[in-house]
Amino acid sequence: MMTGTIETTGNISAEKGGSIILQCHLSSTTAQVTQVNWEQQDQLLAICNADLGWHISPSFKDRVAPGPGLGLTLQSLTVNDTGEYFCIYHTYPDGTYTGRIFLEVLESSVAEHGARFQIP
């Protein structure tokens, strides 16, 4: 019987060009975590395997960093990074738990752009 629950950062936003940490936490179970997959809609970003450690997909190695913990750091964000992200926990003996995060990448704020210019 699967008793665990996944807590995530939920819906988050970040600025274009910046970075964001995606975090999930599995609780309320004594099951052993054997692997965590991080996926974006239909793309596999990275895995953290209990035996091998982290492996980042070659498609994302320049923009994705492992951690902190079992989380994932996305760097150099673009508006195309907007969308659903999933943390998939493979556990024994429970099976698979899935958490969902929605990330919205925003253009830099008007206030920040304005701060770069001096008014004559």
Partner: nanobody, 116 residues
Amino acid sequence: EVQLVESGGGLVQAGGSLRLSCAASGRTFGDYIMGWFRQAPGKERELVASVSGGGNSDYADSVKGRFTISADNAKNTVYLQMNSLKPEDTAVYYCAAVFSRGPLTWGQGTQVTVSS
């Protein structure tokens, strides 16, 4: 569940070439990361090369410029072309794969021996 079957290992002289194949069957849908690891006697298993469903690849420094990983998505097969082989490349080579939402799966391994 995904099954992996490797082939192509053998004995080769230093400077020679071998091509390893890894055929995946079973639950092979969605994006993937597939790779080749190797383990020499008394040493830890190390990543040699990996490839993603998007076709991007990554290599260990020790094999860059000598080994090439490629994938045939229609055949669910990944290849490792090994050129300019050295005695230190001698090891058991293992294929590994993760498909979307799935766990890491290992092949049974194939022996590569490079004689000097």
